[in-house]
Amino acid sequence: DWVVAPISVPENGKGPFPQRLNQLKSNKDRDTKIFYSITGPGADSPPEGVFAVEKETGWLLLNKPLDREEIAKYELFGHAVSENGASVEDPMNISIIVTDQNDHKPKFTQDTFRGSVLEGVLPGTSVMQVTATDEDDAIYTYNGVVAYSIHSQEPKDPHDLMFTIHRSTGTISVISSGLDREKVPEYTLTIQATDMDGDGSTTTAVAVVEILDANDNAPMFDPQKYEAHVPENAVGHEVQRLTVTDLDAPNSPAWRATYLIMGGDDGDHFTITTHPESNQGILTTRKGLDFEAKNQHTLYVEVTNEAPFVLKLPTSTATIVVHVEDVNEAPVFVPPSKVVEVQEGIPTGEPVCVYTAEDPDKENQKISYRILRDPAGWLAMDPDSGQVTAVGTLDREDEQFVRNNIYEVMVLAMDNGSPPTTGTGTLLLTLIDVNDHGPVPEPRQITICNQSPVRQVLNITDKDLSPHTSPFQAQLTDDSDIYWTAEVNEEGDTVVLSLKKFLKQDTYDVHLSLSDHGNKEQLTVIRATVCDCHGHVETCPGPWKGG
C-alpha cells in the first residue's frame, strides 16, 4: 500500500549524511516506471533540503542533523508519478518525529531570586518559589524534568539546614526553628536545578531570603534611673530625655517607642512624648509644679513599642526623680479682678476699698502697692496697706473714662524678693449714680411763625439714671410765660413750647426751667426765632432782639 508509518529520528544524529530513513514504494511500479518526490517544509519549502528522496528508488534521505528544540515534527507529502509525469497515487502524508536528546541544561529564570519571611516563623512556612526551565522534552522523557535542591546556605547560623526546597515545584520553605533577624538578617542560598529528574545536568542560581522583623525584642531603658531639676511654675518645660535601646529594625513600628507614665504623677503634671528621630522619651511639664506644695516627684515610666509584642516580653521601667526648684513667685491679687461699688462724687480723701495681694512663697515677704493705670487720676493707693482712696471727683457720667458705669483701674503689687517680682490686679469701680445732673431740652434753638404758630416739641434728656430722671416738670421764668407756654407730655419725657401772643419777627430768649423726679432743677435758655408767617416755618430773616 501507498502508506508509511510515522518515522522517528533522533535529534543531533552524527550521520553519515545523507542518511537513509525509509523507502517510499508504490505497488504501481509493477506496471510502469515510477518516479518519487517529496514536498513540504523541510523538503521544498523552508527549511529546504533537510529531507530528500532518491527519485527512482524512493529512499527518504536525511541530509543533516535535526534539532528537536527547533522543529519537533515534520509533515511532508510523498508523490509518485509515471514517466509521462502523470500522478499514479494520491499524495501520501509522511510524519517525521524528532526524538529528544538531553542536549540542554536547565536554566533558572533569574540569576538571583529574592524572597522574605518573618523571623521566628514555624518550620514549614513557605518563603518563595524559584523556577528553572529546560528546553528538552519533559513529557516523553526525563531530559527536561527538573529537580530542585539547595546546594549551600550562607551563613550557616544557627545551622546549615534552615530551608528546604520542593524538588519539583521549587518552593522554598523554612525547615528549622531559629530564624532571628537580629542575628542573621539575610540568607543566601545556592540553589540547583538538575535535569533527568535529578540525575542529569545541573545549573545553579542564588536565592536571597530576607528575614523580616517581628517585634520580638522589647525596648530597654539605658539608663534606668534619672534625676532632673525643674523650676516651679514652668509649663512645657523639658524635664528629662529618656533613652531606650531596641534590637528590632530601626524606624519600624517594632522599634519605635511608646512611653507611659505608670505612677508618681498624681496631679497629672507631666507628659511624655517620643522623639521621632532619636526614639527618646521627652518628659515635659504639662502644668506648673509648685515647690511650696511638693518639692520632689518620683515618676515611673514604662516603655513599649508602637507594634504589639509577638511574644510575652518583660517591659522596661525607668525611675525619674524630679526635684522642683524654688522660684520667687509674683504676688497674686485676691481676687485677680475686684468689683467695688462706690458713689460717684464722693469727697476727696474718702476710702474706696482695700485691695491686697498674697505671695505664694513661704517666706514672709513684704508687699508694696501702687496704681499702675488710673486713666482719670481719681484714685490713690497706700503702698503698705493697699488702701485705695479718692483724690479726684468720681464722675459716673464722664464718658471718656467710664464705660457702662464702670471705671477700670490696674494696680500693682511688688515683693521684696531678689530679684523682686510683680503681680497686677484689676479694680473695677461700679459708680453708683447720684442726682447731679438736671434735665436738658433738645433742641435749644427753634423757629416759629407768629401767626397760627405750630407747637414746638422739645426732647428732655438727663445724664443721670432712673429714678433721677423722668417724669420731668417744666416752668417758664423771667417773664417768658407772658408770651409762651410750656407743658410736659403725659409720659413726662418731652416739653411742648407754644407761642400764646403775637410777637413781631425777631429772635427771643425763652427761659425754661426743667426739674427731674428728684427735683434737680436746670435752667436752660431756648433761642426762639419768630417769623412773619403762618403755620410751619423753618427759617426767616430778621435782626436779633433780646426779650
Epitope: 518573618l118 523571623e119 521566628g120 516563623v121 514555624l122 518550620p123 514549614g124 512556612t125 513557605s126 544557627p158 539546614l161 528546604t164 520542593h166 524538588r167 519539583s168 515545584t169 518552593t171 520553605s173 525547615i175 528549622s176 526553628s177 531559629g178 517581628a214 520580638d216 509577638v310 511574644l311 510575652k312
Partner: antibody, heavy 117, light 111 residues
Framework: EVQLLESGGGLVQPGGSLRLSCAAS????????MSWVRQAPGKGLEWVSA????????YYADSVKGRFTISRDNSKNTLYLQMNSLRAEDTAVYYC??????????WGQGKMVTVSS | QSALTQPASVSGSPGQSITISCTGT?????????VSWYQQHPGKAPKLILS???KRPSGVSNRFSGSKSGNTASLSISGLQAEDEADYYC???????????FGGGTKLTVL
C-alpha cells in the same frame, strides 16, 4: 539531658476544659518550635498544634481549631495546651515534642486525657 | 485514613531482616528528604530512630537504616532482635499545612 515532661492530664466531662503543661530542660527552649501530638487508644499519631520559638506563630489541626490554644512561656521553659469544649473524640494520650528540621524530637512521656461523662 | 501508607504489620524471626515501606506523594515523601521513622513500644512515647531519610540519632543501633525512592521511603531492620518488636511510624515533611504527615503505623512482630 534533653527532656520534656508533661503534666495536667486526667478525666474531664464533655464540654469541659483542661490545661496540659510541658516542662523542657537540657536545651535552649526558646530557640525551638514546639508541638503537641496525640494518639487515640489503639490508633496512630495525629499532629494537633505547633508554636514557633518566639510564640508569634501558631498552627492548629482543623479538628481542634477554635477549641484548643497553644502557648509558651520561654522564661519558664514551659509549653501549654489549653483545651476547651472537649469532646469524646479528644480522648487520647497527648505528647509534646520539639518540631524542627522535618522531625519531631524529643518527645515527652505523654499524658492521658479522657473525655467521658 | 492516614496521609502516608504503611503496611499494618510485618514479622520476622530473630536474626532476619525486614523492611517497612511508607508511601506518600510527590508533595511529601517524593518532594523532600525529610522522612522520619519512630519506634513506639506499648505504653511508651514514640522514639526517633531515623531522620532525614537515613540519619540515625546518637544511641540508635546501626541495624536500623533508611532509604527513599520516588514517593516511597523504607525502613530496614537487620539482625532482628526481640526488643525490636514495636509499632513503627513514618512521618514526612509536606508542602503546606499541616507540614507533618504520619503513616498509620506498622506492627512489627518478632517471631
Amino acid at each position: 539531658e534533653v527532656q520534656l515532661l508533661e503534666s495536667g492530664g486526667g478525666l474531664v466531662q464533655p464540654g469541659g476544659s483542661l490545661r496540659l503543661s510541658c516542662a523542657a530542660s537540657g536545651f535552649t527552649f526558646s530557640s525551638y518550635a514546639m508541638s503537641w501530638v496525640r494518639q487515640a487508644p489503639g490508633k496512630g499519631l495525629e499532629w494537633v498544634s505547633a508554636i514557633s520559638g518566639s510564640g508569634g506563630s501558631t498552627y492548629y489541626a482543623d479538628s481542634v481549631k477554635g477549641r484548643f490554644t497553644i502557648s509558651r512561656d520561654n522564661s519558664k521553659n514551659t509549653l501549654y495546651l489549653q483545651m476547651n469544649s472537649l469532646r469524646a473524640e479528644d480522648t487520647a494520650v497527648y505528647y509534646c515534642a520539639s518540631w524542627g528540621t522535618g522531625t519531631l524530637w524529643p518527645w515527652g512521656q505523654g499524658k492521658m486525657v479522657t473525655v467521658s461523662s | 485514613q492516614s496521609a502516608l501508607t504503611q503496611p499494618a504489620s510485618v514479622s520476622g524471626s530473630p536474626g532476619q531482616s525486614i523492611t517497612i515501606s511508607c508511601t506518600g506523594t510527590s508533595n511529601d515523601v517524593g518532594a523532600y528528604n525529610y522522612v522520619s521513622w519512630y519506634q513506639q513500644h506499648p505504653g511508651k512515647a514514640p522514639k526517633l530512630i531515623l531522620s532525614e531519610v537515613n540519619k540515625r540519632p546518637s544511641g540508635v543501633s546501626n541495624r536500623f537504616s533508611g532509604s527513599k525512592s520516588g514517593n516511597t521511603a523504607s525502613l530496614s531492620i537487620s539482625g532482628l532482635q526481640a526488643e525490636d518488636e514495636a509499632d513503627y511510624y513514618c512521618s514526612s515533611f509536606t508542602s503546606g499545612l499541616p507540614w507533618v504527615l504520619f503513616g498509620g503505623g506498622t506492627k512489627l512482630t518478632v517471631l
